[in-house]
């Protein structure tokens, strides 16, 4: 049911990266509007986009409010010029998004090479830690802060000189490792949830060799 | 069910080439690390090399290097292991395994049921 | 490359017997050591993970500890279905490496 000329939205889809939140659907509008809402499980409805003409709605605010609650969200389907009309049940058409747990399904963003630094045959990686929108105390809190020794680092090493790819893990943002003297090597690193069982692993940093710019060698 | 079938083995010639198919189902092998390992005849376990499929790196023994490629398709969900100038060293059971991580700790939690590659004239 | 020493190489025991097999790294290896069991014609069975977590499915009576690079599995009282070949094998660098298998016999 639903008032003439106005569709319900369709294929609400949730797209996150590092808990930025932001709901999707279809179709561009024509002669309509539309208004989104978001709820926890046993919370109230928040309405939010109120009469867009956008098919998307950035729900990154309420989400980080805690991002272990699973959240629903629902869009409001409204004829443009006349957003008081319902449909003839009495209330506007609207469609419900799947389910949605930041902590677990948030995509890991790209994570990046903060610096390495060589002292003899050891190399130190380390891994810039992302800020994320997530805030305790006032503070945005960081990608670790948030998941604390759920997330772990791989890194993916190897000479300049081949191809095979060495790897390494962290639970930190630090990795130390062994190279060969004498060598260059390159860096990559992917964040990972091994908890997870969707979106566990990010893609991979920008590549970083050493004899570039962020690293620094010392001969002990 | 979470499952690897391995296919492809059988007798080849030395210097020959056989691509070995490691099917996975109940999984998505890009969430995962794949790695193949081998069994010589009344021999211990040898590993001989891995592939993250979401990003495609890979290494391998040093006995393999240069011979052994691994790959993968994520639209079959199977990995790869293509192998070429067998010697007869390279006669064995042929197991992938998959990967996973407790904290940064890897763990091979669940392996194919192997498949023979004979090498010999 | 690290490599892992397995001992005993072989060993016989009786039903009901404790069993360890140890494995040393040559050099540090954190906690990133695993164990295996392998049966005749049959794929490794990954029993013990971190040194000491005993995975999903596996009878209490087989237990991992750590000593520094000293690894241990134990099987406190031996089945029939525990006679089997086990190996211990390192994850903590690349290329990972196994032991070279400890060969469970009935006496």
């Known amino acids: 049911s639903g008032t003439t000329n106005t569709v319900a939205a369709y294929n609400l889809t949730w797209k996150s990266t590092n808990f930025k939140t932001i709901l999707e659907w279809e179709p561009k509008p024509v002669n309509q509007v539309y208004t989104v809402q978001i709820s926890t499980k046993s919370g109230d409805w928040k309405s939010k986009c109120f009469y867009t003409t956008d098919t998307e709605c950035d729900l990154t605010d309420e989400i980080v409010k805690d991002v272990k609650q699973t959240y629903l969200a629902r869009v409001f389907s409204y004829p443009a010029g006349n957003v008081e009309s319902t449909g003839s049940a009495g209330e506007p058409l609207y469609e419900n998004s799947p389910e949605f747990t930041p902590y677990l399904e948030t995509n890991l963003g790209q994570p990046t090479i903060q610096s390495f630094e060589q002292v003899g045959t050891k190399v130190n990686v380390t891994v810039e830690d992302e800020r994320t929108l997530v805030r305790r105390n006032n503070t945005f809190l960081s990608l670790r802060d948030v998941f604390g020794k759920d997330l772990i680092y791989t890194l993916y090493y190897w000479k300049s000189s081949s191809s095979g790819k060495k790897t390494a893990k962290t639970n930190t943002n630090e990795f130390l490792i062994d190279v060969d003297k004498g060598e260059n090597y390159c860096f990559s690193v992917q964040a990972v949830i091994p908890s997870r069982t969707v979106n566990r692993k990010s893609t991979d940093s920008p590549v970083e060799c050493m004899g570039q710019e962020k690293g620094e060698f010392r001969e002990i | 069910e979470v499952q690897l079938v391995e296919s492809g083995g059988g007798l080849v010639q030395p210097g020959g080439s056989l691509r070995l198919s490691c099917a996975a189902s109940?999984?998505?092998?890009?969430?995962?690390?794949i790695h193949w390992v081998r069994q010589a005849p009344g021999k211990g376990l040898e590993w001989v090399g891995y592939?993250?499929?979401?990003?495609?790196?890979?290494y391998y023994a040093d006995s393999v290097k240069g011979r052994f490629t691994i790959s993968a398709d994520t639209s079959k969900n199977t990995a790869y292991l293509q192998m070429n100038s067998l010697r007869a060293e390279d006669t064995a059971v042929y197991y992938c395994?998959?990967?996973?991580?407790?904290?940064?700790?890897?763990?091979?939690?669940?392996w194919g049921q192997g498949t023979l590659v004979t090498v010999s004239s | 490359d690290i490599q892992m020493t397995q001992s005993p190489s072989s060993l016989s025991a009786s039903v009901g017997d404790r069993v360890t097999i140890t494995c040393r790294a040559s050099?540090?290896?954190?906690?990133?050591v695993a164990w295996y069991q392998q049966k005749p014609g049959k794929a490794p069975k990954l029993l013990i993970y971190?040194?000491?977590f005993l995975y999903s499915g596996v009878p209490s009576r087989f237990s991992g500890s750590r000593s520094g690079t000293d690894f241990t599995l134990t099987i406190s009282s031996l089945q029939p279905e525990d006679f089997a070949t086990y190996y211990c094998q390192q994850h903590y660098t690349t290329p990972p490496t196994f032991g070279q298998g400890t060969k469970v016999e009935i006496k």
């Open positions: 592939i993250d499929p979401y990003n495609g790196a890979t």
């Open positions: 971190s040194a000491s």
């Open positions: 395994a998959r990967a996973d991580y407790h904290g940064v700790d890897e763990y091979w939690d669940y």
């Open positions: 109940g999984f998505t092998i890009p969430s995962y690390w």
């Open positions: 050099q540090d290896v954190n906690t990133a």
